[in-house]
Interface confidence: low
């Protein structure tokens, strides 16, 4: 792989509404805006709606998210886990449009990938994705 | 090819890094069939909070 990070996006895509729905970042330091409907009750992982075996999923209850969870202080629990994911799409060609988040191609690819993740992580614990970046492979 | 990098958010305690990777890898076949996407070189890691979107100092699996 070569090249530095090209285009990037800081929108959150969540599974509360349609797959196209995005929300504006809450702040520059935390580019996630957690949907309010996730803050009502503790969530457990619905194993029947995932593609993993029930034995490998975690059914622990989690504390509800509240506005106080949005602190940037590392000492406080946010009630949110973040994971960085990287992968290659080998049958897709990188072009200059993917360096510019304003292009239709960039936005379409971002939307398609967002929708794909909404299919993968269907359980209640999934809050969304952010900071999509594309670079040449 | 195109390298895609992104950050996923989950309610704390609902999933771990292994299951994030497992579910994504299980979906690769479906992505190939449904959308004609060939996905490879999957890497998942925890992001400490607060994270810097630009830092990417991660321990890849």
């Amino acid at each position: 792989a070569s090249g530095s990070a090209s285009g990037s996006a800081s929108t959150l895509v969540h599974n509360g509404t349609s797959a196209r729905a995005t929300t504006t970042p809450a702040s520059k330091s935390t580019p996630f805006s957690i949907p309010s409907h996730h803050s009502d009750t503790p969530t457990t992982l619905a194993s029947h709606s995932t593609k993993t075996d029930a034995s490998s999923t975690h059914h622990s209850s989690v504390p509800p998210l509240t506005s106080s969870n949005h602190s940037t202080s590392p000492q406080l629990s946010t009630g949110v886990s973040f994971f960085f994911l990287s992968f290659h799409i080998s049958n897709l060609q990188f072009n200059s449009s993917l360096e510019d988040p304003s292009t239709d191609y960039y936005q379409e690819l971002q939307r398609d990938i967002s929708e794909m993740f909404l299919q993968i992580y269907k359980q209640g614990g999934f809050l969304g994705l952010s900071n999509i970046k594309f670079r040449p492979g | 090819s195109v390298v895609v990098q992104l950050t996923l958010a989950f309610r704390e305690g609902t999933i771990n890094v292994h299951d994030v990777e497992t579910q994504f890898n299980q979906y690769k076949t479906e992505a190939a069939s449904r959308y004609n996407l060939t996905i490879s070189d999957v890497s998942v890691s925890d992001v400490p909070f607060p994270f810097s979107a630009q830092s990417h100092h991660h321990h890849h699996h």
């Epitope: 709606s49 995932t50 593609k51 897709l92 690819l109 398609d112 | 076949t29 069939s33 959308y35 004609n36």
Partner: antibody
């Protein structure tokens, strides 16, 4: 040879439930989605939803959510579609179909269909 | 939901004529270059039969007089030279978004 064989015709009263079976053969059952599509008399085709037999994962058309349930028995390679609270508008031919890749180039599509099961809802 | 609109509702042609059937989606059915639209033929009393998958790929065993074209929202099924056995109803199906949706169908008949 890929085959999907469905259960026989049913006559039901309004409010009752019906369970249609679809037995698959001639291919590896577990990794292929099974779609359910219905067709009212003289009307077009309507997608009801799908099930992935290996995991039991389902996707439903919101129109039928709460009334329809798909299940799969991997020991007999059979998928079931149960529709409850039947009304006269549910009178239709119900098809199961495989979402498979018997196409050249590895592209997937709904390629093999069952013969259809006629469900008549009448008081 | 994605609405699939087929036209015309009925097409009456003589044997040997070219049939052009249209299918329009209310939004793009393309994902990363692949058009997730399929064409089916249904004869009376029979189950639908796959003709074209992913907009333009001819299913194995289907005569070469059938072809598909189009991208994103506008698609066409063409029968280059109509045969008597082509009398049927033709449906397009989008598998881009759940719920999958069919067009209302085009009935092809011989004059």
């Amino acid at each position: 040879e890929v085959q999907l064989v469905q259960s026989g015709a049913e006559v039901k009263k309004p409010g009752a439930s019906v369970k249609v079976s679809c037995k698959a053969s001639g291919y590896r059952f577990i990794p292929y989605w099974i779609e359910w599509v219905r067709q009212a008399p003289g009307q077009g085709l309507e997608w009801m939803g799908e099930i992935l037999p290996g995991t039991g994962r389902t996707n439903y058309n919101e129109k039928f959510k709460g009334r329809v349930t798909f299940t799969a028995d991997t020991s007999t390679n059979t998928v079931y579609m149960e529709l409850s609270s039947l009304r006269s508008e549910d009178t239709a031919v119900y098809y199961c179909a495989r979402y498979g890749d018997d196409t050249s180039g590895g592209y997937y599509a709904v390629d093999y269909w069952g013969q259809g099961t006629t469900v008549t809802v009448s008081s | 939901d994605i609405v699939m609109t087929q036209s015309p509702a009925t097409l009456s042609l003589s044997p040997g004529e070219r049939a052009t059937l249209s299918c329009r989606a209310s939004e793009s059915v393309n994902i990363l270059g692949t058009n997730l639209i399929h064409w089916y033929q249904q004869k009376p009393g029979q189950a639908p039969k796959l003709l074209i998958y992913h907009a333009s790929n001819l299913e194995t065993g289907i005569p070469a007089r059938f072809s598909g074209s189009g991208s994103r929202t506008d698609f066409t099924l063409t029968i280059s030279s109509l045969e008597p056995e082509d009398v049927a109803v033709y449906y397009c199906l989008q598998s881009r978004k759940i719920p999958w949706t069919f067009g209302g169908g085009t009935k092809v008949e011989i004059k």
